[in-house]
């Protein structure tokens, strides 16, 4: 390799100081070693994003409208595998429980709040509104293009993209993945959805010059608005029930 970088994660610091001079990359903000042949976990990416904000780095910063969930960005606690810890707290000792995509699923409390487990988000619904086109996209062509995108770019196994719905101008992409279905090397739907969200916003986490290039029969797909809904294996525990939109 002509230099030591992480093709799948811009938010890393890489060096060849490891055994045998092998290129090793650590996530900014956490110093956790990342596997650059696959997607980095959303928790480590959020942590890196917050550390970049604090240090004033201009790399891959969110647009002013970037909203991950109803609470906005926060500096998460990740476990040693880079996954979200069940309980998250801010600097003022306000705590809450999160699901596996890091979205709050309980009311906020104090440090006595208990979160027994990270509840898995097993169903992610990505809703896109595309820019007006001369004519509607062919549903079948759109379906195969989006399936190809998730398989090729994010390495998500095709079985985890359960459906693509289309009613012009709204596209819905359904990702489903139970804990029992996810193999050791399988990309998590949470990570695929987050990379896709950043790609759509023009904030790609990949190193290369190539941005997202989604086109159906030669017609580019330009996304105007994105909404992401997360459904957990257990219902959220809000005093007033609501579906979490990202």
């Amino acid at each position: 390799q002509s230099n030591c970088t992480c093709p799948t994660n811009k938010m890393t610091v890489c060096d060849t100081n490891g055994p045998g001079g092998v290129c090793q990359c650590r996530a900014m903000g956490s110093q956790v070693l990342v596997d650059c042949s696959t997607l980095t976990s959303k928790c480590l990416l959020l942590k890196a994003r917050m550390s970049a904000r604090k240090s004033g780095r201009s790399l891959v910063m969110p647009s002013e409208h970037a909203i991950l969930d109803n609470d906005g960005l926060y500096d998460p606690e990740c476990d040693d595998k880079g996954r979200f810890k069940a309980r998250q707290c801010n600097q003022t000792s306000v705590c809450w429980c999160v699901n596996s995509v890091g979205v709050r699923r309980t009311d906020k409390g104090d440090q006595s709040l208990r979160c027994d487990e990270v509840v898995r988000t097993h169903h992610i619904l990505i809703e896109l509104r595309h820019r007006p086109t001369d004519r509607a996209f062919n549903h079948s062509d759109l379906d195969s293009e989006l399936r190809r995108l998730f398989q090729e770019r994010y390495k998500l196994h095709p079985s985890f993209l359960s459906a693509v719905h289309y009613e012009e101008p709204t596209i819905q992409i359904e990702l489903r993945q139970n804990a029992s279905q996810k193999g050791l090397r399988d990309v998590d739907i949470a990570d695929a959805a987050y990379y896709f969200e950043r790609d759509i916003k023009g904030e790609s986490l990949f190193m290369g010059r190539r941005g997202l290039d989604v086109q159906v029969r030669g017609e580019p797909l330009h996304v105007e608005r994105t909404l992401i809904y997360y459904l957990d294996e257990k219902p959220p525990q809000f005093s007033m029930k609501r579906l979490t939109a990202g």
């Epitope: 390799q1 002509s2 230099n3 030591c4 970088t5 093709p7 799948t8 190809r148 995108l149 090729e152 770019r153 990949f206 190193m207 290369g208 010059r209 190539r210 290039d213 086109q215 029969r217 030669g218 580019p220």
Partner: antibody
């Protein structure tokens, strides 16, 4: 079956320019990246460049950067390599190749080539 | 790197298993067979481990980190050829190895 037919090779003069054309058939041309690869006599394969599906992105090897232009016509299912300021070291067989992974973060990789043309021979000599 | 690193030659008896390694790439690896100089290469493996439908099942590919391996299980005389690996460098410029000559004894 996928077929890639290159044309436009032959004897070229140093300092001049050449235009190679590759005609594709047997697949949905509009859905795939296209590559050019060359091989000097008695040498190995050398990646020349790539163009994405829409033609909005190209990438070139350092040896040809600034001298090469890859373009495509999706209506005609053709891809063209224009190479200017020719040198003796540009001599070789030029292959057109089909990419297989247009969305991949490493889509420019030679590891994404799944089909090759028969090649067209270029000789740069005075 | 200006080229990927692969052995210049390997040899084996018919029926044996042959492994050819390739290192120094960043991204997907492919393997290409060229039976004679000037003849068109044939893709044997693309995207690390995908085999084209008309390629015999004795050919397989794997990749780990920045190293890829082409394995021919039960090599045959007709497999004699030069095998090139392909990938990219970390600046996304495509790369090939110098080629490995496989001799079946």
């Amino acid at each position: 079956a996928v077929t890639l037919d290159e044309s436009g090779g032959g004897l070229q003069t140093p300092g001049g320019g050449l235009s190679l054309v590759c005609k594709a058939s047997g697949f949905d041309f509009i859905d795939y990246d296209m590559f050019w690869v060359r091989q000097a006599p008695g040498k190995g394969l050398a990646w020349v460049g790539v163009i994405n599906r829409s033609g909005s992105y190209t990438n070139y090897a350092p040896a040809v950067k600034g001298r090469a232009t890859i373009s495509r016509d999706n209506g005609q299912s053709t891809v063209r390599l224009q190479l200017n300021n020719l040198r003796a070291e540009d001599t070789g067989t030029y292959y057109c190749a089909k990419g297989v992974c247009t969305h991949c973060w490493d889509a420019d990789s030679a590891g994404n080539i799944d089909a090759w043309g028969h090649g067209t021979e270029v000789i740069v000599s005075s | 790197a200006l080229a990927l690193t692969q052995p210049s030659s390997v040899s084996a008896n018919p029926g044996e298993t042959v492994e050819i390694t390739c290192s120094g790439g960043s991204g997907n690896y492919g393997w290409f067979q060229q039976k004679s100089p000037g003849s068109a290469p044939v893709t044997v493996i693309y995207n690390n481990n995908y085999r084209l439908s008309d390629i015999p099942s004795r050919f397989s590919g794997s990749a780990s980190g920045s190293t890829a391996t082409l394995t021919i299980t039960g090599v045959r005389v007709e497999d004699e050829a030069v095998y090139f690996c392909g990938s990219a460098d970390s600046t996304y410029v495509g790369l090939f190895g110098a080629g490995t000559t496989l001799t079946v004894l």
